[in-house]
């Protein structure tokens, strides 16, 4: 049988040949008629055998990382029959390791976020290095860590590369720490190999600080005509912390004329100061009011570094504007009668500099023949006024600053002419009658109407008569309906066309004014030859021919 | 787990170099234990091996093709190459590149293979 | 180098048949360094078995290898459908590693 030991050569070495064992068959007996052959996998090429001893020797550097078993095949042939002495046989040479390999950590860059203020012990990461050694080979593969930078805030565990925290660090006053980490093998003896990473460790932000304003008083001014919601100014706190933690919130403390504001601007964490109610100056020209600063978020168990929240003074100084004069009122309105005399009183109207400066003022009236307005603000008629040509005035008076003509405020002054009864009543339209010659008595010829131009303090009420002359000597007669409207009937029977073609009565109105006006208002009847029908006529004037319908009411 | 791409052009030249490169992810190419291949298949026909290299940069290479062939290897990119040089309408393959189980000498993973036409 | 050659270089049979292919070396091979291929259409091979008759991972158990020496064999036990394919055996107990010819199992 095949008589050999496990077959071992060491790593890189680097001599020419290396001896690594025999092979033999137990039928050998030592006089060269046994020939040794080596077959399969390096042989010839990575390993050789002496061909009468049977003894192999690898003739090339090995590299146990590259490949660490051959499994090659033994033959051995007696040469004098040319046959085979032993069945073939397959051998492994194991290449055993030396420690020419250096921990390696493969996962590099390595980076690390912790919270700041973490206590000890606290995990930041952990770093694994990598031996090609063999680790069933003595310590070639074992390894050790150690920290050569970063103590003394942070530590790491010898066998397992666990960086923990060793020390609190506060953010504020360092965010980022870069550790170095060795890995030894061969467990730190002598001879190890070691191999280092850096770490790069950054402080994630705790909210551990309050948002404080740098300034104690502020100075801001408005003007007395910024409308309401005016930015008026902007203050400003700081906070050490970052990001979400240092988000801030500010508001009023102190305000007892609740004028003012402060929102916040969230882009650039800045306090806006807005006017709320508008300031006059010469109210007050001053204010005082005290502002607070808080963290938009904290949490429960920071609330320690957050207990009283920063304040700051702000002196808000009003701005004085000349500002246009004030009338006491929106609008006037006056009253006054018609026909009164040019001259005539009308109103007065007010205005005042609301500034400080009192300046005069001067009164004007936009485009008016009608009044005039003096230095005092009385306004006056420049001719009568007769109100049934106008009943209303829209007034527009200008009040100017002496000092400043640019500072100008207008109002509307309305004037209303108030009715006296000077127009007596009258006919509503021109009236033209006819009456036929064969007329009976009482038969209705017109129903008249009156209009008054004034205006009817309740409701206009009209008298209607005839004349004295023709009453006494009437061919007609008139008859008051109490509606504001008369007819006018046939007091006899018969007329003559030849005789007395037309007719002229003498209507007076009168009106129920104090005192009351009577109008005398002249009623023209013509007579007409008309048929037997009544239908149509003929009078004195042949161009006028009107078909009618005669009927007594 | 460990995945090879081949990557190069598809046609090349009479006389000229082919050039492929087979990028290794999911795994180092540093690794002691493996070399990384190139393999080739003729339309229709059978694999044929070309060569390995182990990441230190120790070369195998077919006898047939060892005159004409280089194999290089750049651990910073996790990529190895294969340069073919003289090439002539019979190199016209498939080419695979392939990792090899060092001790044992079998092929896993494979690449999915590129064809390389050899064509004036 | 050591030439590997395939037999059948076809075989045709049904779904659900066992199929048989040889490897045959032409010097002796150490069963270590023997393993065998799954090729199909337009992919690259696949590792079945290793080490003459170890399965890679993954591989179902209706393949199993055998064999030492200059004569090995690839069985599947019951063709399944995703089984028609070209197998490959190669070696690498001698420089150059060589592959053989490849066996087509095909549909019958």
């Known amino acids: 049988g095949w008589v050999w030991n496990q077959f071992f050569v060491p790593e890189e070495m680097n001599t020419t040949s290396h001896h690594v064992g025999r092979l033999r068959s137990d039928l050998d007996n030592g006089n060269n008629s046994f020939q040794y052959k080596l077959l399969g996998a390096g042989a010839g090429s990575t390993f050789i055998i002496d061909e009468r001893t049977g003894d192999i020797y690898a003739i090339e550097k090995l590299d146990r990382e590259e490949r660490s078993l051959y499994i090659l095949r033994a033959q051995v042939i007696d040469i004098t029959t040319g046959r085979a002495v032993e069945p073939e046989s397959e051998f492994v040479i194991k290449v055993s390791d030396i420690n020419d390999n250096e921990p390696k950590f493969l996962d590099e860059p390595y980076e690390a976020i912790v919270p700041e203020m973490s206590p000890e012990g606290t995990l930041v990461i952990q770093v694994t290095a990598s031996d090609a050694d063999d680790p069933s080979s003595g310590n070639n593969a074992r390894l050790l860590y150690s920290l050569l930078q970063g103590q003394p805030y942070f530590s790491v565990e010898p066998t397992t590369g666990v960086i923990r925290i060793s020390s609190k660090m506060d953010r504020e006053l360092q965010d980022e720490y870069w550790v170095i980490i060795q890995a030894k093998d061969m467990i730190g003896q002598p001879g190890a190999l070691s191999g280092t990473t850096s770490v790069l460790i950054k402080l994630s932000d705790v909210n551990d600080n309050k948002p404080i304003f740098k300034e104690s008083l502020y100075r801001l001014t408005v003007s007395e005509s910024a409308p309401t919601g005016t930015s008026i100014g902007t203050i400003m706190a700081y906070d050490n912390d970052i990001g979400e933690n240092a988000e801030m919130d500010y508001s009023i403390e102190e305000d007892d004329s609740q004028t003012f504001d402060i929102i916040t601007n969230h882009e650039t964490q800045e306090g806006i100061v807005i006017l709320k109610k508008k300031v006059n100056f010469e109210h007050q020209n001053h204010y005082g009011i005290r502002a607070k600063v808080k963290n938009h978020h904290v949490d429960e168990q920071l609330m320690k570094y957050h207990t009283e929240a920063s304040t700051t003074f702000i002196k808000i100084q009003v701005e004085d504007v000349d500002e246009p004069p004030l009338f006491l009122l929106p609008y006037y309105i006056f009253e006054i009668f018609e026909e009164t005399p040019q001259g005539s009183f009308v109103g007065v109207v007010s205005a005042t500099d609301p500034d400080n400066r009192k300046s005069p003022i001067r009164y004007s009236i936009t485009r008016s023949k009608v009044f005039n307005i003096d230095d005092n603000g009385t306004i006056t008629t420049t001719n009568s006024l007769d109100r049934e040509i106008s009943a209303w005035y829209n007034l527009s008076i200008t009040a100017t600053e002496k000092y400043n003509i640019e500072q100008i405020s207008s109002i509307p002054v309305y004037v209303q002419v108030l009715n006296i009864n000077d127009h007596a009543p009258e006919f509503s339209q021109y009236y033209e009658s006819y009456v036929c010659e064969n007329a009976g008595s009482g038969q209705v010829i017109q129903t008249i109407s009156a209009v008054d131009r004034d205006e009817s303090i309740e409701e206009h009420h009209f008298y209607f008569n005839l004349s004295v002359e023709d009453t006494n000597s009437s061919s007609f007669t008139i008859i008051d309906n109490q509606d504001n409207t008369a007819v006018i009937l046939t007091n006899r029977t018969g007329f003559n066309l030849q005789e007395e073609p037309i007719f002229y009565i003498s209507i007076l109105i009168a009106d129920n004014g104090i005192p009351s006006l009577t109008s005398t208002n002249t009623l023209t009847i013509h007579v007409c030859d008309c048929d037997d029908s009544g239908s149509t006529q003929t009078c004195q004037y042949q161009e006028l021919m009107l078909s009618m319908g005669f009927k007594t009411e | 787990q460990v995945q090879l791409q081949e990557s190069g052009p598809g046609l090349v030249r009479p006389s000229q170099t082919l050039s492929l490169t087979c990028t290794v992810s999911?795994?180092?190419?540093?690794?002691?234990?493996?070399?990384w291949s190139w393999i080739r298949q003729h339309p229709g026909k059978g694999l044929e091996w070309i060569g390995y290299?182990?990441?230190?940069?120790?070369?195998y290479y077919n006898p047939s093709l060892k005159s004409r062939v280089t194999i290089s290897v750049d651990t910073s990119k996790n990529q190895f190459s294969l340069k073919l040089s003289s090439v002539t309408a019979a190199d016209t393959a498939v080419y695979y590149c392939a990792r090899v189980y060092s001790n044992y000498g079998w092929f896993d993973p494979w690449g999915q293979g590129t064809l390389v036409t050899v064509s004036s | 180098e050591i030439v590997l050659t395939q037999s059948p270089g076809t075989l045709s049979l049904s779904p659900g048949e066992r199929a048989t292919l040889s490897c045959r070396a032409s010097?002796?091979?150490?069963?270590?360094?023997l393993a065998w291929y799954q090729q199909k259409p337009g992919q690259a091979p696949r590792l079945l078995i290793y080490?003459?008759?170890s399965r890679a991972t993954g591989i179902p158990d209706r393949f199993s290898g055998s064999g030492s020496g200059t004569d090995f064999t690839l069985t599947i036990s019951r063709l399944e459908p995703e089984d028609f394919a070209v197998y490959y055996c190669q070696q690498y107990d001698t420089s150059p590693l060589t592959f053989g010819g490849g066996t087509k199992v095909e549909i019958k």
């Open positions: 010097q002796s091979v150490s069963s270590s360094y």
């Open positions: 290299i182990y990441y230190r940069g120790r070369t």
């Open positions: 080490g003459a008759s």
């Open positions: 999911g795994g180092s190419i540093s690794s002691g234990g493996y070399y």
